[in-house]
Amino acid sequence: CKAMHVAQPAVVLASSRGIASFVCEYASPGKATEVRVTVLRQADSQVTEVCAATYMMGNELTFLDDSICTGTSSGNQVNLTIQGLRAMDTGLYICKVELMYPPPYYLGIGNGTQIYVIDPEPCPDSDF
């Protein structure tokens, strides 16, 4: 197994609809054809898997149907979008990239993107 550099933004603010997007870029040392991308969340001394997708270079990322993540790939960049976020989901979201095929296997882990989620204030009742 070999190490690989992964870059991602330090901070992202989720939209009022609970959507956060960020780019995960990896420095591919070779010509990988099969790539696995995993989003991890670190909070309260625990790391949990948020979502994961394996894709063939040149093809779209395919997350599971019930996944809160969607994404697109372009070269060595993956554009990730996480939906359905609430204030309690604020945390450090880490991009993990694995070059699965062909060998050798490469593993890269980003420094994490701190995603801040602010629940919208409920609208006051209108007199109209």
Epitope: C1, Q42, Q46, V47, L107, I109, G112
Partner: nanobody, 126 residues
Framework: EVQLVESGGGLVQPGGSLRLSCEAS????????IGWFRQAPGKEREEVSC????????NYADSVKGRFTISRDNSKNTVILQMNSLRAEDTAVYYC???????????????????WGQGTQVTVSS
Amino acid sequence: EVQLVESGGGLVQPGGSLRLSCEASGGTLDYWSIGWFRQAPGKEREEVSCISGTGLRTNYADSVKGRFTISRDNSKNTVILQMNSLRAEDTAVYYCTGKLLHPSLWSACANEYDLWGQGTQVTVSS
């Protein structure tokens, strides 16, 4: 709240083997840096081995190199210390320690640890 629990200690003859397990209760050890320390009576506590959060890096004290092997079993939420060719001087209480580092350090062992288990006694004697 994560707690570390060691098991697998016991009495073994010189040249024998033991397999120590460090298990987490109340959480997972995924991406944690895990270390094994030992303390013999009247001696300082010393770090025996450690494994990085990714499992790609392992370190060993000179006194156990080639005899001890540390590994992760994430499916069972445990870290194993396989101890072979045991000697009388390996007799000690063995402690599992852990720390969840920033992701930028997941490929490294921790310099210090937040969490300590209660320890398991290893006695090597004929």
